[in-house]
Interface confidence: medium
Amino acid sequence: EVEKTACPSGKKAREIDESLIFYKKWELEACVDAALLATQMDRVNAIPFTYEQLDVLKHKLDELYPQGYPESVIQHLGYLFLKMSPEDIRKWNVTSLETLKALLEVNKGHEMSPQVATLIDRFVKGRGQLDKDTLDTLTAFYPGYLCSLSPEELSSVPPSSIWAVRPQDLDTCDPRQLDVLYPKARLAFQNMNGSEYFVKIQSFLGGAPTEDLKALSQQNVSMDLATFMKLRTDAVLPLTVAEVQKLLGPHVEGLKAEERHRPVRDWILRQRQDDLDTLGLGLQG
């Protein structure tokens, strides 16, 4: 056992190359210098190491950097990132978007792991806010990322970042999250003309107040039923039959199919029957 701790003659690694795949775990431990590994991390991903061998390489880096890896090493971790625990990642200070992209690429196509969540959290906290480039990157890898944030975390998103948000990024957001995002979107898109503004703001309307819906009803926007059904119930209730008719335009006929569902059912109840009759849809208040 004692002999195994020493590197056999002629086996000392001069560089990180393919010959190392034939090393046993104990040989890697004894023969690969941690400092050499750190400077040549970019080569590790080109070599088909086994999971056990990667464990050894990680152990060597952990010994060299007990306080956490420097960004120069982190950027080139590649598949070794999958071996990291959230506790390891909490020690890191990741400031470069390129580093973040490189690590997200390793996990691409998979659910957001605890490691990735910790990495993103460290990165965003380091930056102080969720800027547009970061948001663009994160939503490209994880379309549901925005909706995984708490309303409190979303409050740090600057309005300028909203330009990076696509409709599918908001698919899983709940009403409280949209309450935070809507005013930011309204601010971000305020200088756009009517039809272009509606295209951009549409996905955020689940956070819109009544007065904004009333304003939209005057702009011939032809809101589809899917968007209408996601509006806040308390924002829809005060709308008149005429305002809903203008808001939905030709889609108003879809109210009949949704009459048992919120917010339509609540809205119908609060309308006068003779007003509902003007729609000619047979809606019963």
Partner: antibody, heavy 119, light 107 residues
Framework: QVQLQESGPGLVKPSETLSLTCTVS??????????WSWIRQPPGKGLEWIGY???????NYNPSLKSRVTISVDTSKNQFSLKLSSVTAADTAVYYC???????????WGQGTMVTVSS | DIQMTQSPSSLSASVGDRVTITCRAS??????LNWYQQKPGKAPKLLIY???SLQSGVPSRFSGSGSGTDFTLTISSLQPEDFATYYC?????????FGGGTKVEIK
Amino acid sequence: QVQLQESGPGLVKPSETLSLTCTVSGGSVSSYHDLWSWIRQPPGKGLEWIGYIYYSGSTNYNPSLKSRVTISVDTSKNQFSLKLSSVTAADTAVYYCAREGKNGAFDIWGQGTMVTVSS
Amino acid sequence: DIQMTQSPSSLSASVGDRVTITCRASQSISSYLNWYQQKPGKAPKLLIYAASSLQSGVPSRFSGSGSGTDFTLTISSLQPEDFATYYCQQSYSTPLTFGGGTKVEIK
């Protein structure tokens, strides 16, 4: 603090009509956001929504009971009522009145009243 | 009608345990999902509304999550007063419907 109180007979004969009233105190049955529901729970079983009413008189009933149910509101007395006709033993339950607030949930309930259908 | 399926129907747990109850809707109900607690001989009490919002006065050990068809009620550290039956309820579509209930008993 809004409170609800059910009242009505605890025993009803089969084929007769069950009548219950819910009195709203500490608030108004005419509140813009609120819907007023009746819900029942047979002994040892789960909860079943019967229907609701808005202060304007608009109603919505559970289709499984619709042919036998009438819910009405009396804004002057701050009350709403339930009538269930042609009752059978299967209608034996604790009957609750409840408020569906603007958060879309039953946030206030009466204490419930047990109604037994038996001859 | 939208069917609400709760699981498990009953569970045994100890004080201090983390307890999770799930509720599945037969079709998407967005976030229109509420959770109630009921003790024997008492009316149900609202715990969580709109899937994840804590009702005023309810202890923070209760939390809700989910959207669409799958929802969860979590009690982070079970207290003696939490032994009761829990119901989920959808308020998206009439008829309003409840889950069958989950009875949380002392182990």
